[in-house]
Amino acid sequence: SQPQAVPPYASENQTCRDQEKEYYEPQHRICCSRCPPGTYVSAKCSRIRDTVCATCAENSYNEHWNYLTICQLCRPCDPVMGLEEIAPCTSKRKTQCRCQPGMFCAAWALECTHCELLSDCPPGTEAELKDEVGKGNNHCVPCKAGHFQNTSSPSARCQPHTRCENQGLVEAAPGTAQSDTTCKNPLEPLPPEMSGTMLM
């Protein structure tokens, strides 16, 4: 079998064997090495020599295999836009941001750029659980049978109705989607004359 070409090598069809780690350089019509994450091109390749890479300076990064001549500047998460940091910037990864608690992403351009307050869910409903927190605004769904939620809130969850008998009480009024069961002390036992079967 033929030995694998090592960059730089000529490419007549403008494609390279390893698309992730190599790129086509049109001036010289050759395939050259990309620089690994955390680095940038310090010297371009030529027909005779390969790309030279250098490490990104502090507070800058490149996330992917690249042929960039600069590193990207690290940017902080903007609290004015409702964002908070979950992981700091490194030479290989930009600052990781998310929406602050109680907020959702309202503007998305490859990443979240602006968060807004989550809408309240009215009594009798709760926010549908999402795979990713802060991804979208609340979608309110009714409490399921046997549960209630009695506030207007972006985050309150439906709770199960109280079972009066578990507390040695009896139900005075049944629970609804918006209110809990009302319990009271059990009634005094009936007088003897009222006991037994009543015949008409």
């Epitope: 001036q27 019509r29 310090s42 010297a43 371009k44 030529s46 027909r47 005779i48 020599r49 030279v52």
Partner: antibody, heavy 120, light 107 residues
């Protein structure tokens, strides 16, 4: 305007090591993606590429000299150096340092040259 | 290694003449050919790169052409300071190699 100036002993004994330095002025040796090269010209006027180096430490050598040559860059002194081991009479030449533009393989700035004679 | 052969080895001409120097490569090198001028006791000076591109500061009477294996350096109207030695150099493959030189003399 970039200027290059070679310096070193004009005479080296056979089997010893030839050492030359090239001082770069008018520009930083670690800027612009440049490579820095050594080329020699034998008494018969034939030019021979020795090799070149980048400030990062990346080097490329002529295979005919690779086993004997070391080229390095000292960014703190803005200098390029050449070491050629086990010299003989055939290494007698004028040694030039030169700059190689980013992404190219020609020489746009040259030093004035340093004659090195190998003899006992 | 890739060989470059210059012709002629020496050339006699007069001021005002148009002269052509040839460089032939032992294999195709696209347009990866460069030309230098060297004065006695001085370093070579880059005139033309990539076969036909004029280096900054070089007079326009110098021009280069060619592709593949055959290249020419032309001086359209010789000046007294042009009577020097000229070298071609290939930058197509390692190792970099030079032609043996063409010496231009006053007739």
């Amino acid at each position: 305007q970039v200027q290059l100036q070679e310096s070193g002993p004009g005479r080296v004994k056979p089997s010893q090591t030839l050492s030359l330095t090239c001082t770069v002025s008018g520009g930083s040796i670690n800027s612009g993606g440049y490579f820095w090269s050594w080329i020699r010209q034998h008494p018969g006027k034939v030019l021979e590429w020795i090799g070149y180096s980048h400030y990062s430490g990346t080097t490329y050598y002529n295979p005919s000299l690779k086993s004997r040559v070391t080229i390095s860059v000292d960014t703190s002194k803005n200098q390029l150096s050449l070491k050629l081991n086990s010299v003989n009479a055939a290494d007698t030449a004028v040694y030039y340092c030169a700059r190689v533009p980013d992404g190219e393989d020609y020489f746009d700035y040259w030093g004035q040259g340093a004659l090195v004679t190998v003899s006992s | 290694d890739l060989q470059l052969t210059q012709s002629p080895s020496s050339l006699s001409a007069s001021v005002g003449d148009r002269v052509t120097i040839t460089c032939r490569a032992s294999q195709t090198i696209s347009s990866y050919l460069n030309w230098y001028q060297q004065k006695p006791g001085k370093a070579p000076k880059l005139l033309i790169y990539d076969a036909s591109s004029l280096q900054s500061g070089v007079p326009s009477r110098f021009s280069g052409s060619g592709s593949g294996t055959d290249f020419t350096l032309t001086i359209s109207s010789l000046q007294p300071e042009d009577f020097e030695t000229y070298y071609c150099q290939q930058s197509f493959s390692a190792p970099i190699t030079f032609g043996q030189g063409t010496r231009l003399e006053i007739k």
